[in-house]
């Protein structure tokens, strides 16, 4: 997250970190069910661990943390690397979470976002770009949903209805390491961090997010079929 600020503790209990050994964060994710996460499809890896209820990026033990293995990864059938359409994936955890103030699912919005909607994006991704500098704790950033026209103008021929753009002033954006993390609008999950320009936070080049309102049926049916 570029030019965000430290999230208040306990305010993002659905935020998950996907980790490679040894404790290497590579993507964010979102708890949407007691045993299921949503993340970006491009975050798919064979072996990874899931950390929930953790505030700092470092692997130091926190009393609220819960660690899991991902036992099943189900990318959306419409996703095709290296494209960015349909960029979402469900991850089944090896067990159900223990609900606490630090670990709690969020509902996926069935309403599509309208331009001007105020949202919050969060993650442990780099806070500088193209340099790499990681934060000590989870970062939060207020962003506004942009019209689809502004989105398409920013990225000609690259935008479809499975995506929406959101941003703020130049210099504020999600970035590498934030993929799969939540965009929360009006208390529900509206999007996932997906892609954007490189370096991040360039003027008139907003972040692009997976438009989850288009996928509520697939999410529900996939969880039911695999529970």
């Amino acid at each position: 997250i570029i030019n965000g600020s430290d999230c208040d503790m306990h305010t993002q209990p659905w935020q998950a970190a996907l980790l490679l050994r040894p404790n290497q964060l590579y993507c964010g994710a979102v708890l949407v069910h007691p045993q299921w996460l949503l993340t970006a499809a491009h975050c798919r890896k064979k072996v990874f661990r899931v950390r929930l209820g953790h505030y700092s990026l470092s692997p130091v033990y926190e009393s609220g943390q819960q660690m899991f293995q991902g036992v099943k990864s189900i990318p959306h059938p419409g996703y095709s690397h290296p494209g960015h359409s349909n960029d979402l994936m469900l991850i089944k955890l090896n067990r159900r979470i223990r609900p606490t103030k630090d670990v709690r699912p969020i509902n996926v919005s069935s309403h599509c976002p309208s331009a001007g909607t105020k949202c919050l994006v969060s993650g442990w991704g780099t806070t500088k770009s193209p340099q790499v500098h990681f934060p000590k704790v989870l970062q939060c950033l207020n962003i506004s949903v942009l019209s689809q026209k502004r989105c398409e103008d920013a990225y000609p021929r690259q935008i479809d209805d499975t995506m929406f753009c959101a941003g703020d002033k130049a210099g504020r954006d999600s970035c590498q390491g934030d993929s799969g993390g939540p965009v929360v609008c009006n208390g529900s999950l509206q999007g996932l961090v997906s892609w954007g320009d490189y370096p991040c936070a360039r003027p008139n080049r907003p972040g692009v997010y997976t438009n989850l309102c288009k996928f509520t049926k697939w999410i529900q049916e996939t969880i039911q079929a695999n529970s």
Epitope: Y26, C27, A40, D178, D197, G207
Partner: antibody
Framework: EVQLVESGGGLVQPGGSLRLSCAAS????????MNWVRQAPGKGLEWVSY????????DYADSVKGRFTISRDNAKNSLYLQMNSLRAEDTAVYYC???????????????????WGQGTTVTVSS | DIQMTQSPSSVSASVGDRVTITCRAS??????LAWYQQKPGKAPKLLIY???SLQSGVPSRFSGSGSGTDFTLTISSLQPEDFATYYC?????????FGGGTKVEIK
């Protein structure tokens, strides 16, 4: 078949110019970042330049900054390297290479260069 | 810039030998290291990415390990086709930098 084919190398005098081309086939070129890497005779690999998929980010090795220009034409599936003010130390085999890392995607995961051309030889000599 | 230091610069080995090549970065690069193999007159070939992930089609006798600043490429049982030069490369930070190379020669 995924393939990269370089062309445009040759013998040029110091101070001269040359334009290298790299023709891509067998993959969706516009989705990938690209690099130029060179290898002087009997020496190791030296990264020269990088260009992102949409050309929004470009970078160069200090040794060529201000003299070389990387560009691409996604409609033509082509990568270019314009080399000006050439010096004897630019003599090398020049490779174009596909970058597996998609820096538009916002994961923190880096791969390497998975597809390389056969190389084109540039000789700078009087 | 991040300096990549490879050792040894050359190694003589026989078919069936276990060969280990090391690469050290001048600053931490997490797991973001690639290994390449290059044969004379040919382009480099990606063997390993993210320090330990085997590129598709690469034989399992090749393995990589390490994180931070110290990395290792191991060939568990050297085959005739493995005699070549091997390079490491750090990939997260521009400018990309390669190690100086390790030539694996026939003893």
């Amino acid at each position: 078949e995924v393939q990269l084919v370089e062309s445009g190398g040759g013998l040029v005098q110091p101070g001269g110019s040359l334009r290298l081309s790299c023709a891509a086939s067998g993959f969706t070129f516009e989705h990938y970042s690209m690099n130029w890497v060179r290898q002087a005779p009997g020496k190791g690999l030296e990264w020269v330049s990088y260009i992102s998929s949409s050309s929004s980010y470009i970078d160069y090795a200090d040794s060529v900054k201000g003299r070389f220009t990387i560009s691409r034409d996604n409609a033509k599936n082509s990568l270019y390297l314009q080399m000006n003010s050439l010096r004897a130390e630019d003599t090398a085999v020049y490779y174009c290479a596909r970058d597996l890392t998609d820096r538009q995607s916002r994961d923190y995961y880096y791969y390497g260069m998975d597809v390389w051309g056969q190389g084109t030889t540039v000789t700078v000599s009087s | 810039d991040i300096q990549m230091t490879q050792s040894p610069s050359s190694v003589s080995a026989s078919v069936g030998d276990r060969v280990t090549i090391t690469c050290r970065a001048s600053q931490g690069i997490s797991s973001w290291l690639a290994w390449y193999q290059q044969k004379p007159g040919k382009a480099p070939k990606l063997l390993i990415y993210a320090a330990s992930s085997l590129q598709s089609g690469v034989p399992s006798r090749f393995s990589g390990s390490g994180s931070g600043t110290d990395f290792t490429l191991t060939i568990s049982s050297l085959q005739p086709e493995d005699f070549a030069t091997y390079y490491c490369q750090q990939v997260p930070i521009f400018p990309y930098t390669f190690g100086g190379g390790t030539k694996v020669e026939i003893k």
